[in-house]
């Protein structure tokens, strides 16, 4: 089973550059759109083009992309213009997963650590930039302070909390918040009274093939909300699951390949084989999503360089009782499925 999605061949062919010094304009105003939106193959997102004019089928991995023909955001693709240096007119859709990250337009390689400014140290991991604060200032003064302010100190990077109503501070609360001020900005502190919070995992970013699911959790040393991500594959793109629906039935809730295979990711292969379950499909307007699942760690070995492990959604069971719109549209608004949280993390 390949975690990497199979690219569809929908290559955008740009107009050739003429013997002039003007670039072809990929956006035209006023907008000129076909009367009805295109029908996209399964797993290809129907999105608004980069000109914010028309509905288009998103460009897929390896396809050409421009400011108009944009890459599939639900597959974690971005338009890499660096191959067209220095004109940057036509790019190629590249996979963010395992390749690198883009922050403020700057490309960082997978695993690269960097400081975007003096306040944060960041690392690029599988297309997600995770940052840790270098300014671990305490929380603002509480209770006695009605007007706390975060101020910049000349010559220092990190801001400090000050209280504008120091003169009105009640004497009897003088010891209440000394702990909050005790830690210097350089020391990581474990906040007491931290209410642990972990959000449900978001729906998988693709209807088929490799996608990303995220959640927010503050279960860490700083009680700091951080984004966690895992890979997900609700169903393979290259299998017609409808062919497996039993006679007289309208749905196949779970599809499971007969043989165990290795997962592949960015040219690397899982160290063991798996026989995953996938969510199936329906012939009516219902769709199937996971309702019993967990997160497993999958170890990958690469032909060159060190191996790595990734968190992956492992489906135990699916249900098919939601009314669904066009599968190309269900992620366009990034709506969560209502009322159904995964039973297991």
């Amino acid at each position: 089973t390949a975690l990497s999605p199979t690219p569809t061949t929908m290559t955008f062919t740009p107009a050739p550059l003429e013997e002039t010094t003007t670039r072809p304009e990929f956006c035209k105003w006023p907008c000129e759109c076909p009367q009805s939106p295109p029908r996209c193959p399964l797993g290809v997102s129907l999105i608004t083009d980069g000109c914010e004019c028309c509905k288009i089928c998103a460009q897929q991995l390896g396809d050409n992309c421009t400011e108009a023909a944009i890459c599939d955001p639900h597959r974690g693709l971005y338009c890499d213009y660096s191959g067209d240096r220095p004109r940057y007119a036509i790019g190629v859709c590249a996979q963010v997963v395992g390749v690198g990250c883009v922050l403020d337009g700057v490309r960082y390689t997978n695993g690269e650590s960097f400081q975007p400014n003096c306040r944060y140290n960041c690392t690029c991991i599988d297309g997600t930039v995770g940052c840790t604060p270098l300014c671990l200032s305490p929380r603002p003064p509480r209770l006695w302070c009605r007007q706390p302010r975060h101020v910049r100190v000349p010559g220092q990077c990190c801001e400090q909390w000050v209280c504008d109503d120091d003169a009105r501070r009640p004497r009897q609360t003088a010891l209440l918040d000394t702990r909050a001020f005790a830690a210097s900005g350089a020391v990581e502190q474990r906040y007491e009274n931290c209410i642990a919070y972990t959000s449900p995992w978001s729906p998988c970013s693709t209807t088929c093939g490799l996608g990303i699911s995220t959640r927010i959790s503050n279960v860490n040393a700083r009680c700091w909300p951080e984004q966690e991500s895992r890979l997900c594959n609700l169903r393979p793109c290259d299998v017609d699951i409808q062919l497996h629906i039993k006679a007289g039935k309208k749905c196949l809730a779970v599809y499971q390949p007969e043989e165990a295979t290795n997962f592949t990711l960015a040219g690397c292969v899982s160290t063991r084989t798996y026989r995953p379950k996938y969510c199936g499909v329906c012939t009516d307007n219902r769709c199937c999503i996971p309702y019993k699942s967990k997160t497993i760690s999958v170890d990958f070995q690469c032909p060159e360089g060190p191996g790595f492990s990734r968190q992956v959604l492992w489906i135990n069971a699916c249900f098919c009782n939601l009314s669904c719109r066009n599968p190309n549209d269900i992620f366009a608004d990034l709506e969560s499925y209502p009322d159904f949280e995964e039973i297991a993390n």
């Epitope: 550059l17 002039t20 010094t21 003007t22 670039r23 304009e25 990929f26 956006c27 980069g50 421009t66 400011e67 944009i70 338009c79 213009y81 660096s82 191959g83 067209d84 240096r85 220095p86 004109r87 940057y88 007119a89 790019g91 883009v102 403020d104 337009g105 700057v106």
Partner: antibody, heavy 120, light 110 residues
Framework: QVQLQQSGPGLVKPSQTLSLTCAIS??????????WNWIRQSPSRGLEWLGG?????????DYAVSVKSRITINPDTSKNQFSLQLNSVTPEDTAVYYC??????????WGQGTLVTVSS | QSVVTQPPSVSAAPGQKVTISCSGS????????VSWYQQLPGTAPKLLIY???KRPSGIPDRFSGSKSGTSATLGITGLQTGDEADYYC???????????FGTGTKVTVL
Amino acid sequence: QVQLQQSGPGLVKPSQTLSLTCAISGDTVSSNSAAWNWIRQSPSRGLEWLGGTYYRSKWYNDYAVSVKSRITINPDTSKNQFSLQLNSVTPEDTAVYYCTRSAPAAFDYWGQGTLVTVSS
Amino acid sequence: QSVVTQPPSVSAAPGQKVTISCSGSTSNIGNNYVSWYQQLPGTAPKLLIYDNNKRPSGIPDRFSGSKSGTSATLGITGLQTGDEADYYCGTSDTSLSIYVFGTGTKVTVL
């Protein structure tokens, strides 16, 4: 006619930050069909492309690997200009610095150049 | 040291023709467009040729460019004293992820 006007100090102390600005007239920094670059020239290194910034539905930066950890190129749409910041400079960064526009015709417009000397 | 090389100097009499070579590899010249720039003494470089063989408006047809495999050539016919300058080729290098310039060639009019 596109014109690029450079400004910034000609002397920078080692370990400090080199800062230059390039004001654009005759085009806009947020043009979808141009990119705005910095190139330097020294006797030891010749012409060396440092990086550029460009807008294609969103802002992108593209930096040379040799300076990637030290360089920042920022567009300023309100002033229609872009800037170069090169941190932790050494005498090896002494060069004539040019701002340039790249379009379909490669680097078709250049600033007048600024000689930046890194010395204590 | 640049990965794209040019001869350090070429010379010819007024009215003659000179050619300047620019040699690279498949990761740069072989798979990318080549541009040529003229730098008169004390001035910024000026674009002469782009996309291997195209001239921006205002550049006389005495200047021509061509590319074959991993090499490119700039030709100057009817050489004039005003053509005395340094000439640089430039191209993108996909393996180094940078835009590279050639080592430069000084043209002398005898």
